[in-house]
């Protein structure tokens, strides 16, 4: 019995098509993705094939404008028309707390939303309950499959998922779950979740009666033969794990924001074994028409997005200097803006111990692409952040040993003066830098906020130590020659959507005055 | 719980018309094949044939001219037909699942007048 | 039709002993292949699937591995229930089995 599986994940809000770095579209003919393109993919392998399943494996949530605006409504709007068959939850699915959860995705949704490892307790528990399922059994032709979901444990660090959820070890939460679905005498199951490829691949080795992983969270791309974009793959897809018990697992993921249509065909024997598996990921690209009907659609929810970008989201009384003839040589109150905007969109308090999981950000300065002039009545509008911040990434979670931060805040100095973006602004860091030193050895302080204190204050890093910072997603895949950061993260979570973090800072500041303060000297 | 079980007679004259059948249970005939096996005394496994999940049949080109396999969906039942039995046909016949992950316990078929 | 031959045809081993069969298709079965291990009664039971996939409830000293048209089953330690005779089973195509080896206490 032969069933395919079609697969997203880490969408992020990307509900119209893109350019092939998953920015926005500038030339149609170029552009990929997007729920209409995808819809015709999903019909055209429904048509052809009888035991079909479409899957997301989480983070629809955050990304663009279309979440900033719509809040979740879109991804249960258009993930029905779509019909997919199951959801699991990522981490960002809880960018707006468990409410923005609840109202506008839960309630709304015709398909089943999964995770066996978040429990609600408390008054939660009972508002939510039925709402998502650790596991839902599907009808597939004349068999059934059972889907269990999990969530990364991370969450209560990525997100807001409250105090009332709880964050279980997806393996020890998954057993039970798929113990019960074989007394139910469902034999070919999947496990279909958001905790990262790693994960994914234990999960195949650990859990007794899963066959086929489907994941998201590390936006891991998998390909088999020659890739036919510019990602590229971390292995072959499917990856197979050999189980403890000595069975071959594929485990699938493909890549992010809906440029790809993962493609997994399963061939189970009677007892619901696995006994071959193949296909790959499907590029979205023009050569595959977008739906006619979904794309009105889509076009009929755009209008309330263009009216979004031109209101006052909140006030500056001072100019917001996002000069590159600034924020390339010096402190620039531009990236203190954002960096403080970045940490206050981190601030977890999980921990007596800790005021916060994170305290210091940094930027390159080059990511900062225009000012923000305080004498058009001091109004700042989407339109206008998206004018600094036009590249469409995301402020992401690392974690880094001290030496690497050194290592970072050298580059960042290695050839000042010929005005490149490497040149870092900061937040919870005071760098001192000396460039009348040879270029590797320009940092002369570099001190760091604590986060295990009552009171903040600034200690010099420490070289074995590991940091929490937060970061733009370019720096952390080694860009503006960052490799060291690439090469020597200890860990790596997406972020939110970087204008999405700065709009909403100033939004619940109403008015912002940043200084240049002395973080850079 | 996946189980495979082949009824039919123990015994069968030559030229006579042998029909056993497989009765399924924990898996769906529309969803699987049946395949059909048998083993002489002492000697090694031989395919019969096959019956697919749409229904249709594949033989073993030896015993094309004699030998039908039918399915009835609802009762979970597959039939196997082999005319003009002789005493060579002797042997443990069994049916297995499509992939052999399941097979029935055999029943010994002797032709002898 | 795709030809299987198993060897050995026969072997004897003591208890703890590491026991290895092989089996070689006359064409690429591309991993389709079974291990079926039948005890004297004539039971058959299917050990390993997809050439090294290990069946439920099967010990974990049987394991199997291969590609192409060579393909290998291994009992790292043989058990007083091990001996019995095994097949090979290729599903590329219509099914054919290999010879069978009888595993014999020596």
């Known amino acids: 019995w032969e069933l395919t599986i079609l697969h997203t994940n880490d969408v992020h809000s990307r509900l119209e098509q893109t350019s092939e770095d998953s920015s926005k579209c500038v030339n149609a003919s170029r552009c990929m993705g997007g729920v209409a393109r995808l819809f015709t993919k999903v019909q055209q392998i429904r048509r052809a094939e009888p035991n079909v399943l479409l899957l997301d494996a989480g983070d629809q949530y955050q990304g663009t404008i279309w979440f900033t605006v719509y809040k979740g409504a879109e991804v249960a709007h258009f993930m029905n028309a779509l019909r997919y068959d199951a959801m699991a939850l990522g981490n960002h699915e809880f960018d707006n707390g468990v409410e923005g959860l609840i109202e506008p995705l839960l309630k709304e949704a015709k398909f089943p939303i999964l995770s066996a490892n978040i429990k609600a307790k408390g008054p939660l528990a009972s508002q939510i309950s039925g709402l998502y399922l650790p596991y839902k059994v599907l009808p597939v032709g004349d068999e059934v499959v059972g889907i269990v979901g999990y969530t990364s444990k991370e969450t209560p660090f990525l997100s807001n998922p409250g105090t009332n959820l709880v964050f279980e070890d997806e393996i020890t939460a998954l057993q039970p779950e798929v113990d019960k679905l074989k007394t139910l005498n469902v034999n070919k199951i999947i496990a279909l979740g958001h905790s990262g490829f790693e994960m994914d691949k234990l999960i195949a080795q650990k859990v007794r009666g899963v066959d086929v992983v489907v994941g998201g969270h590390s936006n891991t791309f998998l390909y088999t033969g020659n890739p036919p974009s510019k990602e590229v793959p971390a292995g072959k897809y499917p990856f197979i794990v050999t189980s403890d018990d000595g069975r071959k697992v594929p485990v699938v993921q493909a890549y992010a924001f809906g440029k790809y249509l993962g493609y997994l065909k399963i061939e189970f024997d009677e007892r619901g074994n696995v006994i071959s598996s193949h296909g790959n990921p499907i590029l979205l690209n023009s050569s595959i028409p977008e739906d006619p009907s979904i794309k009105a659609d889509i076009n009929k929810w755009r209008i309330k997005l263009d009216n979004y970008s031109t209101q006052e989201l909140g006030k500056t009384i001072v100019y917001l200097d996002g000069s590159s003839q600034s924020c390339r040589f010096r402190e620039c109150n531009m990236g203190n803006l954002i960096c403080d905007a970045m940490i206050n969109n981190n601030l977890r308090h999980t921990d007596e111990m800790f005021w916060n999981h994170v305290s210091m950000c940094i930027l390159n300065g080059g990511g900062i692409r225009s000012p923000i002039d305080e004498r058009n009545n001091g109004t700042i509008t989407w339109e206008n952040l998206a004018a600094v911040l036009p590249f469409g990434g995301t402020f992401d979670l690392v974690q880094l040993k001290g030496s690497t931060l050194k290592k970072a805040f050298e580059h960042s100095v290695h050839r000042y003066g010929q005005s490149t973006g490497e040149f870092l602004q900061v937040g919870g860091i005071h760098v001192v830098y000396d460039l009348s030193r040879k270029p590797g050895d320009r940092v002369v302080k570099l001190d760091v906020l604590c986060t295990k204190c009552r009171v903040p204050s600034y200690d010099p890093l420490k070289m074995d130590e590991v940091y929490k910072v937060i970061l733009p997603n370019f720096l952390a895949n080694g860009g503006d020659g960052f490799q060291m950061i690439k090469d020597e993260l200890l860990r790596h979570d997406s972020g939110d959507q970087d204008i999405n973090v700065v709009s909403t800072y100033i939004s619940k500041m109403k008015v912002i005055y940043p200084a240049v303060e002395g973080r850079i000297k | 719980e996946v189980t495979l079980k082949e009824s039919g007679p123990v015994l069968v004259k030559p030229t006579e018309t042998l029909t056993l059948t497989c009765t399924v249970s924990?898996?769906?005939?529309?969803?699987?094949?049946i395949q059909w096996v048998r083993q002489p005394p002492g000697k090694l496994l031989e395919w019969l044939g096959v019956?697919?999940?749409?229904?249709?049949?594949d033989y073993n080109a030896a015993f094309i001219s004699r030998l039908t396999i039918s399915k009835d969906t609802s009762k979970s039942q597959v039939v196997l037909t082999m005319t003009n039995m002789d005493p060579v046909d002797t042997a443990t016949y069994y049916c297995?699942?499509?992939?052999?992950?399941?097979w029935g316990q055999g029943t010994l078929v002797t032709v002898s007048s | 039709d795709i030809q299987m031959t198993q060897s050995p045809s026969s072997l004897s081993a003591s208890v703890g002993d590491r026991v290895t069969i092989t089996c070689r298709a006359s064409?690429?079965?591309?991993?389709?292949l079974n291990w079926l291990q039948q005890k004297p009664g004539g039971a058959i039971k299917r050990l390993i699937y997809?050439?090294?996939s290990l069946d439920s409830g099967v010990p974990s000293r049987f394991s199997g591995s291969g590609s192409g048209t060579e393909y290998t089953l291994t009992i790292s330690s043989l058990q007083p229930e091990d001996f019995a005779t095994y097949y090979c089973?290729?599903?590329?195509?219509?099914?054919?089995f290999g010879g069978g080896t009888k595993v014999e206490i020596k």
């Open positions: 297995a699942g499509q992939y052999g992950s399941v």
């Open positions: 924990g898996f769906s005939l529309s969803s699987y094949g």
């Open positions: 019956i697919w999940s749409g229904g249709s049949a």
């Open positions: 064409q690429d079965i591309g991993d389709r």
């Open positions: 997809a050439t090294s």
């Open positions: 089973l290729q599903y590329a195509g219509s099914w054919t």
